[in-house]
């Protein structure tokens, strides 16, 4: 008799896009409409929840822009929270200072991406320093991962 | 008798580098010489043509530079075109405004990378706002993808 | 009799973080403590040593900052060295010029990431133009790869 068909495991992957009704940290994300992907990973209150331990490539891009540059320091962090640990772990971070000409309309992006060993129940979030300066277009601000 | 050797499927992957004879949009790419990769994906008139539906990590970097900064708005887009859809879909985008000191020699990069669910016959392209400000060195300006 | 258990190959992966005792080029990296990963790849004197030919996604981020901007040109390179070739091959590079306001405290990141066909015994390194301007926090400056 022929062997049972190989069960093709679903790839664990997420690509979430900017959601303009984010009011506080961590950033919230669109998990349903547009060019969104969410498979084998859960989305909960701004966070991607890992349900299988392993190696993951995690990435995020944030698009900052303003109308009258004041050069407020900008930061963009991807961090991890797990009930076993008391403190958030900053996995990746980008900072910008003195990035535009005073008074000018300005725009700048921060991109982060790297490989991490994540554990089941880890929650991953994105934080920014100046929420009012983030533009949430789906092509400009996003957060994702995939299991290697 | 021993089982037939497993047929190892070729990884679908591309890494194309800057081509300085780009004259209009979309950007054209070097698909033959240097550190180029092209396997299981076709290159046609500036575009990467998907021939197998699935999840892909897509990335691009563009290196902008100029002799005398006048802060022209810069944009860098990765977009998708498919004959089934009337309009291009912008997958990822980076924008820069007010990024250098007027009159100075300047240089800046834009990097994009994320996961997308692509369909057979999708064509992926890269667009920039100011072609004359792009430097096409193979290490500086590139476009690639791989199937997860 | 049941077939022998499938030997699950260890994923070839590395994620190294900034090491502040770098004194010269190439940059040196933390390969032991913190959010570091090193599996199926060796680390030697600043370099990641490939021990299996194949396709790899290689990435690096460097965080530059200073107390008083004088717009020194910044460069960030990932390059490859192999005893078979006389010269280093620059795989990816980012350059910045005229990026901050003279005299101001400033901060900026450079991110690089792409797919390459690497050969056993290739050594990969990261180079920067201004070592004194690099901040080595593990979340800010890193270097990694994984085999596709």
């Amino acid at each position: 008799p022929s062997p049972p068909p190989e069960k093709k495991e679903l790839r664990k992957v997420a690509h979430l896009t900017g959601k303009s009704n984010s009011r506080s940290m961590p950033l919230e994300w669109e998990d349903t409409y547009g060019i969104v992907l969410l498979s084998g990973v859960k989305y909960k209150k701004g966070g991607l929840v890992i349900n299988e331990t392993g190696l993951y490539f995690v990435y995020s891009k944030v698009y900052f822009r303003g109308q009258s540059c004041n050069n407020l320091p900008l930061s963009h962090k991807v961090y991890m929270r797990n009930s076993k640990y008391p403190q958030d772990l900053v996995m990746m971070e980008g900072k910008m200072m003195s990035y535009c000409t005073t008074g000018q309309m300005w725009a700048r992006s921060s991109y982060l991406g790297a490989v991490f060993n994540l554990t089941s129940a880890d929650h991953l979030y994105v934080n920014v320093s100046e929420l009012s300066l983030v533009n949430f277009e789906e092509s400009q601000t996003f957060f994702g991962l995939y299991k290697l | 008798p021993s089982p037939p050797p497993e047929k190892k499927e070729l990884r679908k992957v591309a890494h194309l580098t800057g081509k300085s004879n780009s004259r209009s949009m979309p950007l054209e790419w070097e698909d033959t010489y240097g550190i180029v990769l092209l396997s299981g994906v076709k290159y046609k008139k500036g575009g990467l043509v998907i021939n197998e539906t699935g999840l892909y990590f897509v990335y691009s970097k563009v290196y902008f530079r100029g002799q005398s900064c006048n802060n022209l708005p810069l944009s860098h887009k990765v977009y998708m075109r498919n004959s089934k859809y009337p309009q291009d879909l912008v997958m990822m985008e980076g924008k820069m405004m007010s990024y250098c000191t007027t009159g100075q020699m300047w240089a800046r990069s834009s990097y994009l990378g994320a996961v997308f669910n692509l369909t057979s016959a999708d064509h992926l392209y890269v667009n920039v706002s100011e072609l004359s400000l792009v430097n096409f060195e193979e290490s500086q300006t590139f476009f690639g993808l791989y199937k997860l | 009799p049941s077939p022998p258990p499938e030997k699950k190959e260890l994923r070839k992966v590395a994620h190294l973080t900034g090491k502040s005792n770098s004194r010269s080029m190439p940059l040196e990296w933390e390969d032991t403590y913190g959010i570091v990963l090193l599996s199926g790849v060796k680390y030697k004197k600043g370099g990641l040593v490939i021990n299996e030919t194949g396709l790899y996604f290689v990435y690096s981020k460097v965080y530059f900052r200073g107390q008083s901007c004088n717009n020194l040109p910044l460069s960030h390179k990932v390059y490859m060295r192999n005893s078979k070739y006389p010269q280093d091959l620059v795989m990816m590079e980012g350059k910045m010029m005229s990026y901050c306001t003279t005299g101001q405290m400033w901060a900026r990141s450079s991110y690089l990431g792409a797919v390459f066909n690497l050969t056993s015994a290739d050594h990969l390194y990261v180079n920067v133009s201004e070592l004194s301007l690099v901040n080595f926090e593990e979340s800010q400056t890193f270097f990694g790869l994984y085999k596709l």
Epitope: Q67, S68, C69, N70, L72, G103, Q104, S132 | P73 | -
Partner: antibody, heavy 119, light 111 residues
Framework: QVQLVQSGAEVKKPGASVKVSCKAS????????IHWVRQAPGQGLEWMGV????????SYNQKFKGRVTMTVDTSTSTVYMELSSLRSEDTAVYYC????????????WGQGTLVTVSS | EIVMTQSPATLSVSPGERATLSCKAS??????????MNWYQQKPGQAPRLLIY???NLESGIPARFSGSGSGTEFTLTISSLQSEDFAVYYC?????????FGQGTKLEIK
């Protein structure tokens, strides 16, 4: 509530300098740039320049370059605009106005300071 | 620099009637889907007050009888039913790039 309170009227002789202050309250001072706009008697509005309250550097209208200096004192949430080499045509009401970086326009203005240049 | 031209210089309208003020820019003040055009009201002895930002957005606290429209180089401020407190000078201003420039103003007077 948000307030921008400017210093009082000044009378200056041609060739002299004047320094006008603008004290902010009711909001986070370093979150907004401060712009200066002037209005000659019976005339329209003229943009002079802008200062970063966070970083302290300024961008000026070319017309005033070399004569105008904008400074900030974050400890008192005050911005200053100094105009030198005064001439009679500098007689005007000088306004400061805040501009939120995330918005499109100057949303709150000071009450104005009349500077009269006369020999 | 971008030159802003307002018309008419003076507009005489009766209370309760509609007023339409025009502003033209010497080059487009649009970028990325937004029009960087603002309208201010100024009464004698007072500082300007923001009415409309980004061509058509009503500033908080401004009555709904004020509206703005236009894009590119041509913009309009409309006051649907003039109240006595609306008689003042109105300025358009672009914030597309530095230097910001204002129109010369339109004086709205009682007919």
């Amino acid at each position: 509530q948000v307030q921008l309170v400017q210093s009082g009227a000044e009378v200056k002789k041609p060739g002299a300098s004047v320094k006008v202050s603008c004290k902010a309250s009711g909001y986070t001072f370093t979150d907004y740039t401060i712009h200066w706009v002037r209005q000659a008697p019976g005339q329209g509005l003229e943009w002079m320049g802008v200062i970063s309250t966070y970083q302290g550097d300024a961008s000026y209208n070319q017309k005033f370059k070399g004569r105008v200096t904008m400074t900030v004192d974050t400890s008192t949430s005050t911005v200053y605009m100094e105009l030198s080499s005064l001439r009679s045509e500098d007689t005007a009401v000088y306004y400061c106005a805040r501009f939120p970086d995330w918005d499109y326009a100057m949303d709150y203005w000071g009450q104005g300071t009349l500077v009269t240049v006369s020999s | 620099e971008i030159v802003m031209t307002q018309s008419p210089a003076t507009l005489s309208v009766s209370p309760g009637e509609r007023a339409t003020l025009s502003c033209k820019a010497s080059q487009s003040v649009d970028y990325d889907g937004d029009s960087y055009m603002n309208w201010y009201q100024q009464k004698p002895g007072q500082a300007p007050r923001l009415l409309i930002y980004a061509a058509s957005n009503l500033e908080s606290g401004i009555p709904a009888r004020f509206s703005g429209s236009g894009s590119g180089t041509e913009f309009t401020l409309t006051i649907s039913s003039l109240q006595s407190e609306d008689f003042a000078v109105y300025y358009c201003q672009h914030s597309r790039e530095l230097p910001y420039t204002f129109g010369q103003g339109t004086k709205l007077e009682i007919k």
